[in-house]
């Protein structure tokens, strides 16, 4: 369960890949598209509002008999729109929604090497936001074998 309904903190940051490509958002035909692209030097990076929530993970689910806490995030590039996991399509989409947000909008935050982070689907453990063919997609990762998967590493910069 997510502790309380308010985030413990929020920050505005631009999101880029391990290879320094920018994640950008464009309004097309009344819906938002998500792109992964090299930005021209003078172009301003899109900002995303990251809301951080603390989630209690009961020992019955944790597998090691100990209650634990996880840090979950929601990502909103523009008012009332949130990134959501579409597990059926293995895609990442922007949807307009009202609070309380659906579980598909929550991602478990992982600290990774090189001060990067990864976003794991709350609704589908082992599945992460990643980059595929210059788009964001959901990528299944064997956590023990695929630690360095660069396509699921992201940088946050304020």
């Amino acid at each position: 369960s997510i502790t309380g309904i308010s985030p413990i903190t929020e920050s505005l940051a631009s999101l880029s890949t391990y290879n320094d490509q920018s994640i950008t958002f464009a309004l097309e035909d009344e819906s938002y598209e998500i792109y992964v692209e090299d930005l021209k030097k003078d172009k301003k990076k899109d900002k995303v509002l990251l809301s951080y929530y603390e989630s209690q993970h009961p020992s019955s689910e944790s597998g090691d008999g100990v209650d634990g806490k996880m840090l979950m995030v929601t990502l909103s590039p523009t008012k009332d729109f949130w990134l959501q996991a579409n597990n059926k399509e293995h895609s990442v989409e922007l949807h307009k929604c009202e609070k309380p947000l659906p579980d598909q909008a929550f991602f478990v935050l992982h600290n990774r090497s090189f001060n990067c982070v990864s976003f794991e689907c709350k609704t589908d453990p082992g599945v992460f936001i990643g980059v595929k063919d210059n788009h964001l997609a959901l990528i299944k990762v064997d956590y023990s074998e695929n630690l360095g998967s660069e396509n699921i590493l992201f940088k946050l910069s304020e």
Epitope: S11, Y52, S62, G65, L109, N111
Partner: antibody
């Protein structure tokens, strides 16, 4: 319950290497990062490095060339190895666990009791 | 690396008073700051995380505030066990640096 316990050699000769083992219980190394911190007697705290849940490592920039951190998940052990010790490496060495699964943002709730390492001829 | 400047290095106070310690980060760290206290010969204890969140079991007379680069830590109604050392630590990016510490004296 969650426990971390360091075991070290106590005394190390200058220019030799240091190996400390952190035995952990009550949690899984595949879910939590373990960090090493040291404290020179009467001084402040120095963060040395981390072995993250995913297996990647991070190190103190000034000590990176002399440090390595590894683990044996089957034995629930994390290891700190430090080469070419000097007298100013004399300190209490702590292993600590992340507050959050997979993330260091929440600081460190659980600390070992520390092991004193003296570097002296 | 992010430098953490903690002040004062030492402070005198009396039982029942309030004290404030500050920590400045050399670059923005969002809210990713923790405060610890350490009794002599003991391991540090987490008091505050995410700049303002009280760790489990920590009395409400401890509080934290700030974000970005400037942070404060306050103890109200000082008790005898509070006259020890305190440290801030940034957890925004590795290496996770500590402030130099503050010794609270009676």
């Amino acid at each position: 319950q969650v426990q971390l316990k360091e075991s070290g050699p106590g005394l190390v000769a200058p220019s030799h290497s240091l190996s400390i083992t952190c035995n952990v219980s009550g949690f899984s190394l595949s879910k939590y990062g373990v960090h090493w911190i040291r404290q020179i007697p009467g001084r402040g705290l120095d963060w040395l490095g981390v072995l993250r849940a995913g297996g990647s490592t991070g190190y103190n920039s000034a000590l990176m060339s002399r440090l390595s951190i590894s683990k044996d998940s089957s034995k629930s052990q994390v290891f700190l190895k430090m080469n070419d010790l000097r007298t100013d490496d004399t300190a209490v060495y702590f292993c600590v666990r992340d507050h959050y699964y997979y993330s260091s943002y929440g600081g460190f709730v659980y600390w070992g009791q520390g092991t004193l390492v003296t570097v002296s001829a | 690396d992010i430098q953490m400047t903690q002040s004062p290095a030492s402070q005198s106070a009396s039982l029942g008073e309030s004290v404030t310690i500050t920590c400045l980060a050399s670059q923005t760290i969002g809210a990713w700051l923790a405060w610890y206290r350490q009794q002599p010969g003991k391991s540090p204890q987490l008091l505050i995380y995410a700049a303002t969140r009280l760790a489990d079991g920590v009395p409400s007379r401890f509080s934290g505030s700030g974000s970005g680069t400037e942070f404060s830590f306050k103890i109200n109604n000082l008790q005898a066990e509070d006259f020890v050392s305190y440290y801030c630590q940034q957890l925004d990016s590795s290496p996770y640096t500590f402030g130099g510490g503050t010794r609270l004296e009676m």
